[in-house]
Amino acid sequence: ATKLTEEKYELKEGQTLDVKCDYTLEKFASSQKAWQIIRDGEMPKTLACTERPSKNSHPVQVGRIILEDYHDHGLLRVRMVNLQVEDSGLYQCVIYQPPKEPHMLFDRIRLVVTKGFSGTPGSNENSTQNVYKIPPTTTKALCPLYTSPRTVTQAPPKSTADVSTPDSEINLTNVTDIIRVPVFN
């Protein structure tokens, strides 16, 4: 059984969250993909989406969010630059497949943004300078507004819950690790 894990990323204000979601290449390569925030007890809210059909490794920038869909690798890269404390929350990638319900991808991201600068060296930038060298592109296709009731979520359950998906059996498990993502000076 595949486990739908939740990874916790602890970052400082101004840093960049740089994550990836993988998908079944053969099924979803050109499907439209989205980055959503899940607020407790609310419907997931779409913050950014790729074009429809999704273009290969073509960066789409919506405010401080940059999406890059690597069709040939079955990976959606998501960057959230210049993070703010209010960006803290639970995020997920989904694939839009109308008229069917959105397909949730691995993994969910629990983002915790705190004030102050972390001097720890590492893989996430505290400056957005380089990120904006990407030619800014806005989505030509609007992100669909519908969201499946099945994806309405509260905070991850204390006990393991089974969630069925079209592809595989998924166990929703509690957070086991915190990824403290370091920054570049």
Epitope: D18, S57, Y70, G74, S123, S168
Partner: antibody, heavy 122, light 107 residues
């Protein structure tokens, strides 16, 4: 002990397929990507592709697309890389390497298998 | 694809020498660069990640610097056990590519 243990050397004929295994131990297998890198004798390192052991999804570079299949068996913590339609240029040492967390865009390889020599010869 | 060009392709130095290897990226890769050491007949070993961060357990004589397109790998005082080939690797986008390697020998 945190390690990746690969299967033994193989000799194959052109047109055949080879399946290399990589057994992970000492860490949570499904939490980190597995990557495959090959190295022809006296040559540099060539990244072939990746696999998420949790979802089973994988991707490979254009050069190998259609010829390479990456799979896993989570119950025994083994990743597999199968390369088909072998040709003499595929003669190389094939390495499995652990990547970053499955959700992270951090493609560094901090744990490597010892490599599997695949010789393609008629 | 991003091309990674290492120089020199080989070098010879004496024990105690300061050794520098450079890696040039064909486009801006920010700090998405790693350095590996590969001893003859062995698998590569991660030394530096994200351009400048020393991997756990790696001696402090190894260091890395740079960002954008120009990167440097330094051994502050060469030791006999440092005889190996060194590779840079980027991950700014896909596909991941390695430099062609720098072979280091002792004089």
């Amino acid at each position: 002990q945190v390690q990746l243990v690969q299967s033994g050397a193989e000799v194959k004929k052109p047109g055949a397929s080879v399946k290399v295994s990589c057994k992970a131990s000492g860490y949570t297998f499904t939490r980190y990507d597995i990557n495959w890198v090959r190295q022809a004798t006296g040559q540099g390192l060539e990244w072939m592709g990746w696999m998420n052991p949790n979802s089973g999804n994988s991707g490979s570079v254009q050069k190998f697309r259609g010829r390479v299949t990456m799979t896993r068996d989570t119950s025994i913590h083994i990743a597999y890389m199968e390369l088909s339609s072998l040709r003499s240029e595929d003669t190389a040492v094939y390495y499995c390497a652990r990547g970053g967390y499955t959700s992270s865009w951090r493609w560094y390889f901090d744990l490597w298998g010892r490599g599997t020599l695949v010789t393609v010869s008629s | 694809d991003i091309q990674m060009t290492q120089s020199p392709s080989s070098l010879s130095a004496s024990v105690g020498d300061r050794v520098t290897i450079t890696c040039q990226a064909s486009q801006d890769i920010r700090k998405h660069l790693n350095w590996y050491q590969q001893k003859p007949g062995k698998a590569p070993n991660l030394l530096i990640y994200d351009a400048a961060n020393l991997e756990t357990g790696v001696p402090s004589r190894f260091s890395g610097s740079g960002s954008g397109t120009a990167f440097t790998f330094t051994i502050s005082s060469l030791q006999p056990e440092d005889i190996a080939t060194y590779y840079c690797q980027h991950y700014a986008n896909l596909p991941i590519t390695f430099g062609q390697g720098t072979r280091l020998e002792i004089k």
